[in-house]
Interface confidence: medium
Amino acid sequence: YKAEVTVSQVYSGSLRVLNRHFSQDLGRRESIAFRSESAKAQKMLQELVASTRLGTYYNSSSVYSFGEGPLTCFFWFILDIPEYQRLTLSPEVVRELLVDELLSNSSTLASYKTEYEVDPEGLVILEASVNDIVVLNSTLGCYRYSYVNPGQVLPLKGPDQQTTSCLWHLQGPEDLMIKVRLEWTRVDCRDRVAMYDAAGPLEKRLITSVYGCSRQEPVMEVLASGSVMAVVWKKGMHSYYDPFLLSVKSVAFQDCQVNLTLEGRLDTQGFLRTPYYPSYYSPSTHCSWHLTVPSLDYGLALWFDAYALRRQKYNRLCTQGQWMIQNRRLCGFRTLQPYAERIPMVASDGVTINFTSQISLTGPGVQVYYSLYNQSDPCPGEFLCSVNGLCVPACDGIKDCPNGLDERNCVCRAMFQCQEDSTCISLPRVCDRQPDCLNGSDEEQCQEGVPCGTFTFQCEDRSCVKKPNPECDGQSDCRDGSDEQHCDCGLQGLSSRIVGGTVSSEGEWPWQASLQIRGRHICGGALIADRWVITAAHCFQEDSMASPKLWTVFLGKMRQNSRWPGEVSFKVSRLFLHPYHEEDSHDYDVALLQLDHPVVYSATVRPVCLPARSHFFEPGQHCWITGWGAQREGGPVSNTLQKVDVQLVPQDLCSEAYRYQVSPRMLCAGYRKGKKDACQGDSGGPLVCREPSGRWFLAGLVSWGLGCGRPNFFGVYTRVTRVINWIQQVLTGGGGSGGGGSHHHHHHGSHHHH
């Protein structure tokens, strides 16, 4: 004889009692009415289960809450099921057995027939776990039921001093959805908030959970699939303040079925978004967007932001949204890179895009911009990277495409290709009035528009010019003169310690900024416009440095220990971190500070020139870094502004030296013997290069490196030409992670020298 092996299967759910009504007393677990009613309802539930074939497996049950409308009872029960029957008793099967019993004409005296008029239609049975019951029980000392009426914004108060964990059981009208808003009010906290697409904390119905005060999402809104949600708030440390504000609403279901016809043009034509964007999409989301293109000359491009699509095996669920496009199943996933999905049009001029949430776990709402592209030439003058659907510069010496194909099969890499014999000449020799190619093709078409390419400059009228780096050189190369606009920049003021550096003179680097907290220099920066300073995103990584209010920006400063008439200071009104900045990889290490009032330019305070996306900084070129950083590794910051010349290093060698951890958004400069380099405290400071015109252009921002001035490990800088589009977008008011910024991370505040 062998004892039968059983497993405990937990079910959670709710049922409606049509002949009873909810009262306020039943909403308070400590009331006598609740204790009495829950005991009777628990007995009723036990009888119901016992009267089916599940009765022999019955272990225990509990009615833990009541809800509005006809009285809704929320419960769990445990069945000890033989191992071999475990898979056959799914929540659907269990529900069917219980509904059958409720509908049967059996002449039982059980309370579910005599005393309670249970609505079979309203019976909900969900799979749960023993752990779910443990979590639920841990919150019962602070269990709060709330019915959310339409139009009402209900604030949810946090756990008090006595309790460490609370559960809100939220319910709204059946035809509406519950939407919770969470707003962080403190910089540092260790609280956890979990939201469930059910009345109780069922792990399998988790929508999202957040831990610590996330700077990435200072405000988040989360949708349930319907009219019920559970929110568990677990306190992480003793505090008299709630670290966030929680509130809840009942909102109408929003449709996302769209039919659109696009126009025959190549710019962005609009966007598709999940309901209540930027709210988290609901677990019940199903969107269907049908787009029609004007002709088969065009393909459709979907432009995603911090979200990408990839193929997934059919037996695997998509955990961050499922996409069906032209019978292709793709899974969405969050990423800190841009991404475009290109949909070629072959037989039909229409495409249907379906987006579905396959599981209860959701994420931030998805917004996708759409545009057309020319199928015969999807990336004029550039290379189509099939990995991410983006158009990237080709043959410029930088592998922009993850598979490196943009730098394969190049006749000339980071050089100009002569038309007559495909000879390569260095870019500064193009349009310099001296023929270098056999028949002088490097000096042709220098006064007219040319097809746009990797090194051509794009004028405001979208035409391109052949001359490399024509910006602000005193010659109008664009028909509309746009290459000579916004040129009040890059000129030194009065004069014509960084590791290995020398002292700067007043007005020599008038764009140099000192970013300080409570009178202490933390990072460098550069003035780029009358209200904008650029710096490195990693300066703001620590929670204690995340708020714009903490920072003071000094311009025209020479010495840290004294003030002089040429210097001015500003508070920071807004801080923008690059939305793709990643602490671990140092990628997209750039931030913008909006000053509280405009700068008045002078001999000691004026902006540096920003390069165009096509600006070419030639490897081997001597450029300069400036800052008050340490003059030796581990040393104190310098008192006087230091300057040092460094040479730009080719990307391939730089990447090789750092074992391929150098991204296209990075640029290297330094020396084989080390000695001259940036160091702690220089972070965010400018790497500037002088053009033949005499103007200084911002090539990089001090970002990271191995040690300071170490042999064979030069400095790594944020490559400004690769983030210039984002910079321009923010400067012109196009947003880009304002106020708080990027990631919830912990790190030291300045130059990442490991």
Partner: antibody
């Protein structure tokens, strides 16, 4: 005068070892990457090995990897090539050469100063 | 790593131009702009004539010029003179701290 003088060559049996030296003078030795390049009789140049100024970056040709070791003594201004498990095909004139410029972080991978070479003959 | 491919010989009369090619792969000549050219007279050490594809060290006559197209680099000697008769070798960086040479081209000045 900038000068490189190789020594240590000679006749050696297969499987045996030899150590070549290259004495540098007339320039700041530890500013430069150094190389060994060989030339078999009547044949072309073949790059053998290279070493960064502070010895932390080293490269070898596939044909000698695991058998030859490059090293340098910056205090003595000497470059070495330790050759083990010698083969008849290692017979050549071995040149020591200096990288063009000690200023760049990165090398031009170009040799602007060469020695006159030392002959290594591997024969039973 | 494989040697770069050069024609075994090239020739020209005094005053003429001659071009020597050097073909590698997309991993060396095609990828890096670190192509050098060396001149070697009999029983002498090599001398660098061109580096970084087209740069001339001081002291090298401007009759010597270098260029590159795709995986092929070229050395052009214009206004050929008797003293230009020598062996010419190309070299390229090949990644992973390795350098590769060409097999060499014997340049003959006719007449």
């Amino acid at each position: 005068e900038v000068q490189l003088v190789e020594s240590g060559g000679g006749l050696v049996q297969p499987g045996r070892s030899l150590r070549l030296s290259c004495a540098a003078s007339g320039f700041t030795f530890d500013d430069h990457v150094m190389y060994w390049v060989r030339q078999a009789p009547g044949k072309g140049l073949e790059w053998v090995s290279g070493i960064s100024w502070n010895s932390d970056t080293i490269g070898y040709a596939d044909a000698v990897k695991g058998r030859f070791t490059i090293s340098r003594d910056n205090a003595k201004n000497v470059l070495y090539l330790h050759m083990n498990s010698l083969r008849p095909e290692d017979t050549a004139l071995y040149y020591c050469a200096r990288e063009k410029d000690g200023d760049f972080y990165y090398n031009y991978f170009v040799m602007d100063v060469w020695g006159q070479g030392t002959t290594v003959t591997v024969s039973p | 790593q494989s040697a770069l491919t050069q024609p075994p010989s090239a020739s020209g009369s005094p005053g003429q131009s001659v071009t020597i090619s050097c073909t590698g792969t997309s991993s060396d000549v095609g990828f890096y702009n670190f192509v050098s050219w060396y001149q070697q007279h009999p029983d002498k050490a090599p001398k660098v004539m061109i580096y970084e594809v087209s740069k001339r060290p001081s002291g090298v006559p401007d009759r010597f010029s270098g260029s590159k197209s795709g995986n092929t680099a070229s050395l052009t000697v214009s206004g050929l003179q008797a003293e230009d008769e020598a062996d010419y070798y190309c070299s390229s960086y090949a990644g992973s701290n390795k350098v590769v040479f060409g097999g060499g081209t014997k340049l003959t000045v006719l007449g």
